[in-house]
Amino acid sequence: NFMYSKTVKRLSKLQEYQQYYPSLTCVMEGKDMEDWSCCPTPWTSFQSSCYFISTVMQSWTKSQNNCSVMGADLVVINTKEEQDFITQNLKINSAYFLGLSDPKGWRHWQWVDQTPYNKNVTFWHSGEPNSPDERCAIINFRSEEWGWNDVHCHVPQKSICKMKKIYI
């Protein structure tokens, strides 16, 4: 009876999400493998988040708008492990917008989700950021490693969206 009611709850939750995400990929997790964590298909999952690599080329504002339409934000990178996971799926000859910007050009960087910008957990390429006119951050592959670079916000780039996992 308990299992039955849990299944019914899950099904109704799935139907609720179905209007936003036609397909979800779920995995069982938790102490008793009773919880399901889901990401929209074909998003990838790492820890408690889902990630989507958008290969359409858009300005930073449009990229954030595009993520937002999907219930996400441009990616906020909190750890080196998270960045290493993300970069596994990136093309080395491309650049991707992050959810990091300096709107006034005062070198006050801020994340889209209001996570405090911590200078100690940043992965700028050597010599970056280097221009107050370049107010948006990308991740790209340079000098044999992935790192961040400041760029003009209106020049179209690919992007990475991030959202919290859906728990049912």
Partner: antibody
Framework: DVQLQESGPGLVKPSQSLSLTCSVT?????????WNWIRQFPGNKLECMGY???????YYNPSLKNRISITRDTSKNQFFLSLNSVTTEDTATYFC?????????????WGQGTLVTVSA | DIQMTQSPASLSASVGETVTITCRAS??????LAWYQQKQGKSPQLLVY???TLADGVPSRFSGSGSETQYSLKINSLQPEDFGNYFC?????????FGGGTKLEIK
Amino acid sequence: DVQLQESGPGLVKPSQSLSLTCSVTGYSISSGYYWNWIRQFPGNKLECMGYISYDGSNYYNPSLKNRISITRDTSKNQFFLSLNSVTTEDTATYFCVRGGDYDDGGFAYWGQGTLVTVSA
Amino acid sequence: DIQMTQSPASLSASVGETVTITCRASGNIHNYLAWYQQKQGKSPQLLVYNAKTLADGVPSRFSGSGSETQYSLKINSLQPEDFGNYFCQHFWIIPYTFGGGTKLEIK
């Protein structure tokens, strides 16, 4: 004020390469924005061909496959279009255009255009 | 690619009249739409960006509206200098494609 000016041969033979130059005054092409080539066919249809960004990165319209190359010479503040293996279908007026104005919402600066005819 | 369908292809009107040109996108372009005017032998001139904002120096008789996939350009009280070709162009995702154009002729 920013000004763009196209130049190049007006007549190209089929199977040859089309080469055009855009000379920019009033703004350094390596300082910002992205720099496009757009063409307008005889029936007035407009097509974005591709661009070179201020940082030297490129985008090419997939419809042009591997025929297109856009390069630049920052010392002369010029950027270039090369289109290989042209056919009569490439006959058009070619414009160079600055991209990225109004948070990338419209193309405000265009060259006056140069007509290129592909004919034997 | 997003396809832009513009209508009508041609339009005859008299000075003083009001005309409307429409553009339909094959997908939601989130108001990232521009309108241009082009005179014979000249390059296109930006009139409107972001669906409804007039570019610098554009007279207030021009106005843009619309959302999602449907957009329009309205010209109130047509002036002799308004005749020519009009194009829409979306700016949502690269490549930014144009509508087929509307030829506005004097009646």
